[in-house]
């Protein structure tokens, strides 16, 4: 369990991630929760991966914003859009690959402030 806080004092929110593992060739979930906001349009979710130039996924103004998405994640990601309003920023990942392993950052912006937390994601053939 990793709990992260925003950097800017009173304008910080708590973001919580859980280290997880994904089976190669199957679908995985990268877990992330945050202090909810009352307005969906005020929430921005960014998933980033260490060593990857583009974004893993971005959700803002109530919809997926994928113009900056890295090609290795194209067509493979989704948030639980109906659960964002209650503070769920978890990411669905389709067709997990060996190269998906690594450190991910769940970065959140709401009207209350900003926050982020890292997540270690392991991949392999788990039973």
């Amino acid at each position: 369990l990793i709990i992260g806080f925003g950097i800017s004092g009173r304008h910080s929110i708590t973001v919580t991630t859980v280290a997880s593992a994904g089976n190669i060739g199957e679908d995985g979930i990268l877990s992330c929760t945050f202090e909810p906001d009352i307005k969906l349009s005020d929430i921005v979710i960014q998933w980033l991966k260490e060593g990857v130039l583009g974004l893993v996924h971005e959700f803002k103004e109530g919809k997926d914003e994928l113009s900056e998405q890295d090609e290795m994640f194209r067509g493979r990601t989704a948030v639980f859009a109906d659960q964002v309003i209650v503070g769920n920023a978890s990411l669905r990942l389709k067709n997990v690959q060996l190269t998906d392993a690594g450190t991910y950052k769940c970065y959140i912006i709401t009207s209350k402030g900003k926050g982020n937390a890292n997540l270690e994601y392991k991949t392999g053939a788990f039973s």
Partner: antibody, heavy 121, light 107 residues
Framework: QVQLQESGPGLVKPSQTLSLTCTVS??????????WSWIRQHPGKGLEWIGN???????YYNPSLKSRVTISVDTSKNQFSLKLSSVTAADTAVYYC?????????????WGQGTLVTVSS | DIQMTQSPSTLSASVGDRVTITCRAS??????LAWYQQKPGKAPKLLIY???SLESGVPSRFSGSGSGTEFTLTISSLQPDDFATYYC?????????FGGGTKVEIK
Amino acid sequence: QVQLQESGPGLVKPSQTLSLTCTVSGGSISSGGYYWSWIRQHPGKGLEWIGNIYYSGSTYYNPSLKSRVTISVDTSKNQFSLKLSSVTAADTAVYYCARGLSTIDEAFDPWGQGTLVTVSS
Amino acid sequence: DIQMTQSPSTLSASVGDRVTITCRASQSISSWLAWYQQKPGKAPKLLIYKASSLESGVPSRFSGSGSGTEFTLTISSLQPDDFATYYCQQDNSYPYTFGGGTKVEIK
């Protein structure tokens, strides 16, 4: 519900560029959450996925056609388009536009009715 | 690219028959498989997505099963409206690919 309609010339000369437009009604391309695809079907044959686009303009093309394909979007007109350059008789097909179910599940629904494009001089 | 192989290519059946069509992927695609029905001169119609989820409005006589590399579409009791060509499609990874089709014709 969302409906799609292809439009464009039914006859294109060899070596020229095939241009088709898909007009979306009953929903906004800009609402996000979906990839918009082009798919073709050669006469009496199976289906071939050409490529797709997100409302923000991000594209992915089938490597077999990548060097000749351009897909673009015009959110103000609620349309997306296909351009296929240097066509030959082998590009004669019914061209369909379609929407994926979500950003992660690209089973296609709905589809346009399709438009036959013949490449001939 | 992932190759999708359907069998049989043609199937002769009668109204009321139970019909099964198979689709095999050249590598594992988990459950990322869709089935379509196409009638002459018409666009394909989505029947099943994610291997076994029935698309809204599709009759319950259609069902899908399988995961990994082997999938089946079953029509529990063939109706006159079901004589058509059926295609499978993988959306596990780019480029998305379709099977060659199975034509279900009247015996």
